[in-house]
Interface confidence: low
């Protein structure tokens, strides 16, 4: 997260760290007791490593009473996701067991109504991604509030040049932005999960390259079919 600040500890109990061989790789969001939603491209970087999910964390390194690392029983990328595109960049991870819920661990309601968030709406994005262009990684969860950007502006030739489909949304990226390591994390508007940070190799913090988020409402049927 660029230009953000440290989040209030455990105030985002849906927040997950998707880890490979014990290292944070991507963000994720607990959407059901046994399911974490993340970005499909995150798996590409996992190679053959052991994928696990950390829940109930604020600090990645410090002992915290609510922290627990779960093995992954099943990884389900969206069937149409491809390495060469950010389309359908969603991944569902089934935990090896139901998460132990509590004040620091609980699922986040996700948007089912397939309607664009109003431009200008302030949405919260959080993660353990890099906090500087130098690549400094935070130990504690960071967050930032970002205004939603209308799709027409986001698709300008100077911006993303038509790459933003109806199944994606954008947020402003003027010095405050999601970045590497935040992929798969939640974009929360009005207390509801609206978007998932896409995992392309986009430049961060440049206002001409807005943040791109996969709209979960556009994938309600797929999510429901996997969780069923």
């Amino acid at each position: 997260i660029l230009g953000g600040r440290e989040a209030e500890a455990h105030a985002r109990p849906y927040m997950a760290s998707v880890q490979v061989n014990g290292e944070h790789l991507c963000g994720g969001v607990l959407v059901a007791e046994q399911w974490v939603l993340s970005a499909a491209h995150c798996l590409e970087d996992a190679a053959d490593g052991k994928v696990q999910v950390l829940l109930g964390a604020h600090s990645l390194s410090q002992p915290e009473p609510s922290k627990r690392l779960y093995d992954v029983l099943r990884a389900v990328p969206h069937p149409d996701s491809r390495p060469d595109t950010i389309d359908h960049d969603l991944l569902l991870l089934q935990l090896s067991e139901k998460a132990t819920l509590g004040p620091a661990v609980r699922p986040l309601p996700w948007q089912r109504v397939d309607r664009d968030v109003e431009p200008g709406t302030l949405c919260d994005v959080a993660g353990w991604g890099i906090v500087s262009h130098a690549g400094r990684r935070p130990d504690r969860l960071q967050h930032v509030l970002l205004p939603v950007l209308d799709r027409a502006t986001c698709n300008r030739r100077t911006h993303h040049d038509g790459a933003i489909t109806q199944r994606m949304m954008c947020a402003e990226s003027n010095r405050r932005d999601s970045c590497k390591g935040d992929s798969g994390g939640p974009l929360v508007c009005g207390g509801v999960l609206e978007g998932v940070v896409t995992s392309g190799s986009r430049v961060c913090g440049n206002r001409k390259k807005p943040g791109i988020y996969t709209r979960v409402a556009s994938y309600a049927a797929w999510i429901d079919s996997v969780l069923a």
Partner: antibody, heavy 122, light 107 residues
Framework: EVQLVESGGDLVKPGGSLKLSCAAS????????MSWVRQIPDKRLEWVAI????????YYPDSVKGRFTISRDNAKNTLYLQMSSLKSEDTALYFC???????????????WGQGTSVTVSS | DIVMTQSHKFMSTSVGDRVSITCKAS??????VAWYQQRPGQSPKLLIY???TRHTGVPDRFTGSGSGTDFTLTVSNVQSEDLADYFC?????????FGAGTKLELK
């Protein structure tokens, strides 16, 4: 102005049932998690049930699990607590409480009703 | 279950004094602790959450501190309306639990 008004408290025999209600006003009820907390005669507070905004997530302490059920009707702005197999130790003043919206502080209670009294005695 | 222990059931004070009410958790709860005030005949009111954040409208004479297992609510320049019961609560894990309360009374 936020208001939580509990009702339904009564004198009931051990083994009996009772349903408490909490009428909420002054805020968007469907946007908040809610809990019931009871205060026994020696003033101790005990949390007894929690409901997420759409009641898809509920949780209870062991002392009431299987006997109490929390539910809500967001259309009527009302929270309920169905109590069955009541015991003398359930005698208390029952408060309806609101949880402030994340991320302002997790499961704390920022508003409390005035309480409704439940007495379990033969 | 996490037990919250308020070792003083009563604390005596005078108007204008400074008083500290303590609460000890049976295990590490980070800073997930709230404090409530209950005046006679009234329902509890939220004062402090995240151990040290004052709730909206709470006078700045109320200060919370601590982390891990030891927590303190300090009331400086005590006013007559502060004479009440004070409860701590942890919300790091279920069940949510409260301390038994400390009654602040006049000397």
């Amino acid at each position: 102005e936020v208001q939580l008004v509990e009702s339904g408290g009564d004198l009931v025999k051990p083994g009996g049932s009772l349903k408490l209600s909490c009428a909420a006003s002054g805020f968007t009820f469907s946007g908040y998690g809610m809990s019931w907390v009871r205060q026994i005669p020696d003033k101790r507070l005990e949390w007894v049930a929690i409901s997420s905004r759409d009641n898809s997530f509920t949780y209870y302490p062991d002392s009431v699990k299987g006997r109490f059920t929390i539910s809500r009707d967001n259309a009527k702005n009302t929270l309920y607590l169905q109590m069955s197999s009541l015991k003398s130790e359930d005698t208390a003043l029952y408060f309806c409480t609101r949880h402030p919206y994340l991320p302002t502080g997790g499961y704390v209670m920022d508003y409390w009703g005035q309480g409704t009294s439940v007495t379990v005695s033969s | 279950d996490i037990v919250m222990t308020q070792s003083h059931k009563f604390m005596s004070t005078s108007v204008g004094d400074r008083v500290s009410i303590t609460c000890k958790a049976s295990q590490d709860v980070g800073t997930a602790v709230a404090w409530y005030q209950q005046r006679p005949g009234q329902s509890p009111k939220l004062l402090i959450y995240w151990a040290s954040t004052r709730h909206t409208g709470v006078p700045d004479r109320f200060t919370g501190s601590g982390s891990g297992t030891d927590f303190t609510l300090t009331v400086s320049n005590v006013q007559s309306e502060d004479l009440a019961d004070y409860f701590c609560q942890q919300y790091t894990s279920y069940p949510l639990t409260f301390g038994a309360g400390t009654k602040l009374e006049l000397k």
